[in-house]
């Protein structure tokens, strides 16, 4: 048949790869969009065909697998390189077909140079590892299927440019890396490169990831509220513009989500008929800890509006906490001559010294929040 | 199949410059790191330094910085050792060689290059 | 910078005979050691990577060994064509440095 289920262009698999190196890439068909692996799809009597287009081309055109010394292949649902060359980038589509079925996807394969300190353009994954926590590893990623178990590659690890080897509290062990501790000194990007024979040749893997010291989960605390506060009143005359900043700070946690809302005489804020408006900025501190801070506005606040609730939430895998912010109408101050004739009149025309007015002391603004 | 080609042999007078190549064929140029090693007639081999032609970072041994430059044209896939203030002890075989990061620094090795150094 | 000291100079051996070689590192080298022979009027010839990796093409009565600073290469069954001078490599830090070679004649 002519008609073929296109999948169009999955851009969720960007693959990028080292120039010369072995690559292998699996037809995205059998692990995103259908149903059946390829051996029941084979079983069937369906083939698998490639096919690509160059980078900055139009015109799709088949892969040739006459190369010298095989350099592209082809082996069940994977497509092999080996090994890879600049020009090799380009859309790949594997489709699948017999007289009666079609399904095709293509993705974009991009062949990336390195430099001597293994930078490239390379998108890198980044793992994760808790500070002062105790041994934890690294593994060099995507190697499995280069090479079956009976042959040992060799393996050298790198941070950043420099081979590692007799740091203190780093240990290559083959395709692990082993923290004895971390700090926030190990923070960087380490690179695992891979040596392994086959047929004759001689191939190597290069494999970047990014490792970042987070806050331990030893230390992790539930979220904390540093404003709204007791010690800080949000005094205001109807009309001046209320502004109330929720700052919270949040422990690292591993897949943690960290959410910070107000609540306005216990409702959402977009439920109470208010011109409410809310900004949010978040901050994070050398070992992801977080810091959030929403601030609550009302440009023209009424008298009622200084009658209300006003609640800041905030929730992690932790626990869930809640502060009200002390909100008070402004008591409006006598005015001096009205103060200064009633002190006269009452002292009958006594020192002349005002009399002094309690509600001066206090700190009209009370606005101790952090743009 | 991978390839060094060193250029000819090269006679120069004490106090002179020279610079010999050694092109590169059967792989890409510039994911390998070059090597460069002297040996003085009869004598061992010894470490000159490494050339990346991916972004041209070298590595020298000290006794050779300000003696030996090391350079790579991306465009030909050729590196290029230049041999300053020439002196009799200079007199030697260079090769260059191919090598990878960290596990296998020398794989294949150019047939090297004779330099005379004679007045 | 790392000294690497081989052993024997030069030695005899007999075709079919096992023989041994030794490096020694002045530091530990983490197995970052290539063996090279070089035959007479030719370029060196890697035979062995990271103290026991056989290079490609290589015979396998060639084998390498070691760790630290002691490293060793052993021919199992001497021919004709591994007469030569043997290099020993390390490659552990800058600047790589060899041993100063072992020359291995017929007996």
């Known amino acids: 048949s002519e008609r073929c289920d296109d999948w169009g262009l999955d851009t969720m698999r960007q693959i990028q790869v080292f120039e010369d190196e072995p690559a292998r890439i699996k037809c995205p068909l059998f692990e995103h969009f259908l149903k059946f692996n390829y051996s029941t799809a084979h079983s069937a009597g369906l083939t698998l065909i490639w096919y690509w287009t160059r980078q900055d081309r139009d015109l799709e055109e088949p892969i040739n697998f006459r190369l010298p010394e095989n350099r592209i292949s082809k082996e069940k649902d994977v497509l092999w390189f080996r090994p890879t060359l600049l020009n090799d980038t380009g859309n790949y589509t594997c489709m699948l077909r017999n007289t009666t079925y079609c399904s095709k996807v293509a993705f974009p394969l991009e062949v990336v140079q390195k430099d001597s300190c293994f930078n490239s353009p390379m998108k890198l994954p980044v793992h994760k590892l808790y500070i002062e926590y105790g041994i934890q590893r690294i593994t060099c990623p995507n190697v499995d299927g280069y090479f079956p178990s009976s042959v040992k590659p060799t393996i050298t690890w790198y941070m950043g440019c420099y081979k590692i080897q007799n740091f203190n509290n780093v240990i290559p062990e083959g395709m692990n890396l082993s923290f004895l501790i971390a700090f926030i000194s190990n923070n960087g990007n380490y690179t695992c490169v891979v040596t392994y024979p086959e047929n004759g040749r001689t191939f190597h893997l290069t494999r970047t990831l990014t490792v970042k010291v987070v806050g331990s989960p030893k230390n992790a605390v539930p979220p904390v509220i540093h404003s709204p506060n007791d010690h800080v009143v949000y005094e205001k005359e109807p009309g001046e513009e209320l502004l109330i900043p929720c700052t919270v700070y949040f422990s690292f946690l591993m897949d943690s989500r960290n959410e910070v809302w107000w609540t306005i005489d216990g409702k959402k804020p977009d439920d109470i008929p208010i011109d409410v408006t809310i900004n949010e900025s978040i901050s994070h501190s050398r070992t992801e800890d977080e810091t959030r801070t929403q601030i609550l506005s009302i440009k023209k606040v009424t008298s009622e509006d200084l009658k209300r609730s006003y609640v800041c939430h905030a929730r992690s895998a932790k626990g869930e906490v809640a502060k009200a912010a002390t909100v008070k109408q402004k008591v409006p101050a006598p005015r001096y001559t009205v103060e200064l004739a009633c002190g006269f009149g009452a002292t009958g025309g006594g020192s002349g010294k005002p009399i002094p007015n309690p509600l001066l002391g206090l700190d009209s603004t009370h606005h101790h929040h952090h743009h | 199949q991978v390839q060094l080609q060193q250029s000819g042999a090269e006679l120069a007078r004490p106090g002179a410059s020279v610079k010999f190549s050694c092109k590169a064929s059967?792989?890409?140029?510039?994911?390998?790191?070059m090597q460069w090693v002297k040996q003085r007639p009869g004598q061992g081999l010894e470490w000159i330094g490494t050339?990346?032609?991916?972004?041209?970072?070298?590595r020298y041994t000290q006794k050779f910085k300000g003696k030996a430059t090391l350079t790579a044209d991306k465009s030909s896939s050729t590196a290029y050792m230049q041999l300053s203030g020439l002196a009799s002890e200079d007199s030697a075989v260079y090769y260059c060689?191919?090598?990878?990061?960290?596990?296998?620094?020398?794989?294949?090795w150019g047939a090297g290059t004779t330099v005379t150094v004679s007045s | 910078d790392i000294k690497m000291t081989q052993s024997p100079s030069s030695m005899y051996a007999s075709l079919g005979e096992r023989v041994t070689i030794t490096c020694k590192a002045s530091?530990?080298?983490?197995?970052?050691l290539s063996w090279f022979l070089q035959k007479p009027g030719k370029s060196p010839k890697t035979l062995i990577y990271r103290a026991d990796r056989l290079v490609d093409g290589v015979p396998s009565r060639f084998s390498g060994g070691g760790s630290g600073q002691d490293y060793s290469l052993t021919i199992s069954s001497l021919e004709y064509e591994d007469l030569g001078i043997y290099y020993c490599?390390?490659?552990?830090?800058?600047?790589?440095?060899f041993g100063s070679g072992t020359k291995l004649e017929i007996k």
């Open positions: 059967g792989y890409t140029f510039t994911s390998y790191w």
């Open positions: 490599l390390q490659y552990d830090e800058f600047p790589y440095t």
């Open positions: 530091q530990d080298i983490n197995t970052y």
């Open positions: 060689a191919r090598g990878y990061f960290g596990n296998l620094v020398f794989d294949v």
């Open positions: 050339i990346y032609p991916g972004d041209g970072n070298t």
